[in-house]
Interface confidence: medium
């Protein structure tokens, strides 16, 4: 089937970066400036994306691939292919309709994006709070209160839980 189609359809021979020009006897013509075709056999070239305003050009458009955008400093990408830019906040804040607002007591955000999340409840795991939480950091849970009582067997206490959102260094 593919062989038959290629014999009947001269456009299938046009490579990426060109289009099949019906105005010129279906000759493969290069994509005009500021356009591209990422696959062969196309009858038109697509207009290149322009990274304007809050968008910055991360990768220039070529005849075979679209431009790629990211966001200007102070903003981060949202959506497939960075379709939108959202403003950063400071750690310890979240973005609301009223702009960047501090995390409420009992919540934290250790990133410049996303929402404030509740501190870990250490007691749910039978542990105690080793380090108090802040707006920027989760609490650190330590050994259970029973492990700290006098006469408890001397076992090595477990390592503090890793803070959410952080990968090991």
């Amino acid at each position: 089937f593919e062989r038959t189609r290629s014999l009947q359809d001269p456009c299938s021979n046009c490579p990426a970066g060109t289009f099949c020009d019906n105005n010129r006897n279906q000759i493969c013509s290069p994509c005009p400036p500021n356009s591209f075709s990422s696959a062969g056999g196309q009858r038109t070239c697509d207009i290149c994306r322009q990274c304007k305003g809050v968008f910055r050009t991360r990768k220039e458009c070529s005849s075979t691939s679209n431009a790629e955008c990211d966001c200007t400093p102070g903003f981060h990408c949202l959506g497939a292919g960075c379709s939108m830019c959202e403003q950063d906040c400071k750690q310890g804040q979240e973005l609301t309709k009223k702009g960047c607002k501090d995390c409420c007591f009992g919540t934290f955000n250790d990133q410049k994006r996303g929402i404030c999340r509740p501190w870990t409840n250490c007691s749910l795991d039978g542990k105690s709070v080793l380090v108090n939480g802040t707006k920027e950091r989760d609490v650190v849970c330590g050994p259970s209160p029973a492990d700290l009582s006098p006469g408890a067997s001397s076992v090595t206490p477990p390592a503090p839980a890793r803070e959410p959102g952080h990968s090991p260094q």
């Epitope: 809050v54 959506g79 939108m84 830019c85 959202e86 973005l95 609301t96």
Partner: nanobody
Framework: EVQLVESGGGLVQPGGSLRLSCAAS????????MIWYRQAPGEELEWVAN????????YYVDSVKGRFTISRDNATNSLFLQMNSLRAEDTAVYYC????????????????WGQGTTVTVSS
């Protein structure tokens, strides 16, 4: 083509007033939140104010509260920023931007921007 075009900038003395306009075309203006941003020389973009689809919700950065007023006219697809009691620190390029169509999923992103209009406050 989706487009935003700002106008109304200029040179004004401290304490003076300006009214910025933003003309929208190519999309259903009344479906979207709209936002004003500004960028002072050598600084990052700063959010100034935003307004919801029907104009019933308006929010401002602290530094302009009581001096700036954001408004919109959905009949003419226009966004406005009335700036009173201007200060030297308000000097910047002001941009209007299209926000979300409901701010769903905590996304406060912008996808369409104007070319900006320059406001200079100087004596």
């Amino acid at each position: 083509e989706v487009q935003l075009v700002e106008s109304g900038g200029g040179l004004v003395q401290p304490g003076g007033s300006l009214r910025l306009s933003c003309a929208a075309s190519g999309f259903t203006f009344s479906d979207y939140w709209m936002i004003w941003y500004r960028q002072a020389p050598g600084e990052e973009l700063e959010w100034v104010a935003n307004i919801n689809q029907d104009g019933s919700e308006k929010y401002y950065v602290d530094s302009v509260k009581g001096r700036f007023t954001i408004s919109r006219d959905n009949a003419t697809n226009s966004l406005f920023l009335q700036m009173n009691s201007l200060r030297a620190e308000d000097t910047a390029v002001y941009y209007c931007a299209r926000g979300g169509d409901g701010y769903s999923n905590s996304h406060y992103g912008m996808d369409v921007w104007g070319q900006g209009t320059t406001v200079t406050v100087s004596s």
